[in-house]
Structure formats: C-alpha cells, structure tokens
Amino acid sequence: EVEKTACPSGKKAREIDESLIFYKKWELEACVDAALLATQMDRVNAIPFTYEQLDVLKHKLDELYPQGYPESVIQHLGYLFLKMSPEDIRKWNVTSLETLKALLEVNKGHEMSPQVATLIDRFVKGRGQLDKDTLDTLTAFYPGYLCSLSPEELSSVPPSSIWAVRPQDLDTCDPRQLDVLYPKARLAFQNMNGSEYFVKIQSFLGGAPTEDLKALSQQNVSMDLATFMKLRTDAVLPLTVAEVQKLLGPHVEGLKAEERHRPVRDWILRQRQDDLDTLGLGLQGGIPNGYLVLDLSMQEALS
C-alpha cells in the first residue's frame, strides 16, 4: 500500500466510534488525533478493531506519550494492553488498584505473561509492599502468585496481608517460602482461639518449627495427613510418638499408608519400636529395644 499521509476529505475522526473499523491502517494513522484517542480510550474496547488496527492505535499513543502513558489512559487500555511489551510497561507508573484489576481482567484465564509480570512488579514496587488489597487481587487472578515470589520478596509482605491468603494460594510454595510466611501468619492469627487458629494456620505449617508443633499437639487439633506430610522433616523428627498421636488424633491411622514416605519414614527411624507398637498400626523400622539412642547433633555442638 502506497504511503499516504494526508487524511482524505471528510474522514477526520471527531470521536472514537464504530465507523473507524472501516478505515484502512493509513487512514487511521492520518485521521485519528492521538489526543482524541487518549481521552476516549474507554470506547476502543467496545469496538471490534482488527489486531492490525490496534497496532496503529498503539503507535499513536506511543507518539503522544514517549515517556510512558498516564494512568488515565492505562486504566482503559483493555485489549490494547495485550499489544504492550514489558519495555512499554516499565515506563508506566500504575498506582491505582482499579487500573491493575482492569488490566489483569484482560489477561484473565491465561498464564501470567511477561507483560503481566512486569505490570505487577511495577505496581508492587510503586506501593513499597504487598498490602492486603493488592495480595487479594493478585491471588484472585493468579492463585499461584504468592509462591512465585522469592523468599526475599515475601519478606516485604506485612502480617496483615496474610488474612487475604487462601489455602490454594500456597499449594506450590516450597519450604523456603513457607519458612518466611509462617512467622507472619502466626503473628497475624495470634489473637484467635484454638480451633479457629488451627484452621487459619494449617496451610502455613510447612514453615513451623518443632516447638510450635509440640504446642499444637496439646490442643486436640486433629491434623490431617496431607498437612502432616507437608511439615518440615527437621521439625517432625524430634516429636515423640505420643505427640504425633495427639497431633493427628483420629488421622493417626494414616501413618501406615505413608510409612515409606518422608517425613513419616524418617520419623519412624528415630522412634523406639516399643513406642511405635503402642499405636497398633504395625509400623516397622523403629529403634530395636535395648539400643542406646545418641543425639549426634548435640554431641557435635558440644565438641
């Protein structure tokens, strides 16, 4: 197509409306004023432009705002957001949660794209911390968001934000991440009573130390096996048979099915067979009667 720069007579756009979808790309370029486009961005998303036409509109905005788009435009980008590169987004200063939601909505149902990751990064850095409302929003769109953060990034999550976390948001977290999140959760839920506290803290227990597990065993919590299997091995090993029995309650019978898997396997190896036999589950592999148990870690500390 021959480059044409002048807008044909009578085709100058006075508003952003459906008539523009019949414009050729060069006509859009020549006949749509960038400032008009910026003020009527909210209309673009309700008009069935082709991807090629959207490219032209993006180009016009890029020319108008070389330093990055203002938030008033960003909030109404809609599908034009999918045309943005991470480099474009790094120029933005997004401060409104409404803007973030509007753009996440466009990408809804898809994996987190590099554009979305950049947007979230810009937004969170701009806010200085992952506050509750932001976390609420991000985990609603991306349940795995929290577990995609490094332990260092998680350290900026204030305890108050933990209230926004749902169990499924922690499904893919590894022990290092739970080590950071658990103390925050413990602080956030500290004023709750026993059973309510356990319901809230349960998802975070993969970061709990031995002493907290011992304390829980005194509270009739009836921890399920799925939760027990996610506990830190080093936190489970020092627990006595009696403590594990109290911790699991009626779920203790599930230990038999898990006896070959960590942390159950390693815990069994640390228990006296006599004590294991008291459970009546047929657990094997404990320390035979009459054997002396040396705590080598304590010996190393003393030498």
Partner: antibody
Framework: QVQLQQSGAEVKKPGASVKVSCKAS????????MHWVRQAPGQGLEWMGR????????NYAQKFQGRVTMTRDTSISTAYMELSRLRSEDTAVYYC??????????WGQGTMVTVSS | EIVLTQSPATLSLSPGERATISCRAS??????FAWYQQRPGQAPRLLIY???NRATGIPPRFSGSGSGTDFTLTISSLEPEDFAAYYC?????????FGQGTKVDIK
C-alpha cells in the same frame, strides 16, 4: 432498517446442547460486536458474552466459561450461541444484541429455551 | 466482576409522578454506564448511555446522572407506557454486568 432476527423456541433435555442463531440485517455485520444476554422467567438480565464478527474473537462471562461457544458466519451475517450441558436453570429467553461503544442499541426478539426432562 | 446494586426493587407510583431509581457499582465504572427499559413481553431497549446521554428516540422526561460508583435514572413525570422494568448496566473493559432490576408499577 437495522434488525436482528432470532431462531425459534427450543425444548431440550438436561445434558443436551442448544444452538441459537441471530441474523443481522440493515447494517454492516462485521462493524459491531454481537452480545448475548439471557433472562430466566421472572428474573433479571444476565450478560453471557460477546463475539467480534470481524475476527471471531470472543469474551465470555466467567459463569459460562467452558459451556458457551459463540461463533459467526459473516457470509450470511449470522451470529450463533451454543450452550452445552444444559440444566433446568438454563431455562430462559436468550437475546442477541448489537453492541455499540456506548451500549446495546438493537436487540433480537428473543428465543425461549426450555430445559425439561 | 463489578456488582451493580439497584434500589428500590419495586417502585409503586401513579401516572404523572416522578420516579427515581438508584444504582451503585461495587467499584468505579467511570461513566461507562447505561440504563435499559423492558416492557412486559418485550426485549430491553437502551434508554440512557454514558450515564447521562439519552439514546435516539428517547423522550426528554428520562434523564440519567452520576459517575464513578453512584448513578440515578429519573423519569420526571410517569406516562402509562413507562410502567416497566428498568436495568442499570456497566461495561468495564469487556466485562459487562446488569443490575438486578427495578420494577415500576402502577399504584
């Protein structure tokens, strides 16, 4: 004049699918989004989704994701809405409506879909 | 998704009286907001768009106001044909939602 003509009433069994058509006339079909809205007996309006007749691109309300499919045939200026795995709660009047940048300005007459065993 | 809450659910008035219907959005929708009228047995029709603009052919007794989260539809003097259901509607990006409706009936 601008018109949207919908297909006739349907009676379906639970678990079946229904496909409603909406024929546009009096305007350029590819120039406007086509929306689908339903209304259960005695209830309010519920937006189901929209199709871009230009590209075939669709956006569905989360509630209907996975059950609804919107398609179009530009050669006959017709949009289609198919709803699968029907249940009794899907009994409703289904409307197609032309989307303008400011709202839905032209509506079809509605298609009654009854789901009953 | 943005939730629209209309009030009242029912409005019982006489012809000639003024009707006021409110709609509140759970978050700001700017002015991407419309009102529809639906008479019994008919398809809805667009009354007001962009919060305050009357659609083609809509008489001046219908007016809309508001922006952000709070919107109002006013019918200055009810005519017999105005007794119908009214729905507010928003489009935020491409996610469209309707209010639950307000029925205006004859007292």
């Amino acid at each position: 004049q601008v018109q949207l003509q919908q297909s006739g009433a349907e009676v379906k069994k639970p678990g079946a699918s229904v496909k409603v058509s909406c024929k546009a006339s009096g305007y350029t079909f590819t120039g406007y989004y086509m929306h689908w809205v339903r209304q259960a007996p005695g209830q309010g309006l519920e937006w189901m989704g929209r199709i871009n007749p230009n590209s075939g691109g669709t956006n569905y309300a989360q509630k209907f994701q996975g059950r609804v499919t919107m398609t179009r045939d530009t050669s006959i200026s017709t949009a289609y809405m198919e709803l699968s795995r029907l249940r009794s709660e899907d009994t409703a009047v289904y409307y197609c409506a032309r989307g303008r940048y400011y709202g839905m300005d032209v509506w079809g007459q509605g298609t009654m879909v009854t789901v009953s065993s | 998704e943005i939730v629209l809450t209309q009030s009242p659910a029912t409005l019982s008035l006489s012809p000639g009286e003024r009707a006021t219907i409110s709609c509140r959005a759970s978050q700001s929708v700017s002015s991407n907001f419309a009102w529809y009228q639906q008479r019994p047995g008919q398809a809805p029709r667009l009354l007001i768009y962009d919060a305050s603009n009357r659609a083609t052919g809509i008489p001046p007794r219908f007016s809309g106001s508001g922006s952000g989260t709070d919107f109002t539809l006013t019918i200055s003097s009810l005519e017999p044909e105005d007794f119908a259901a009214y729905y507010c509607h928003q489009r935020s990006n491409w996610l469209y939602t309707f209010g639950q409706g307000t029925k205006v009936d004859i007292k």
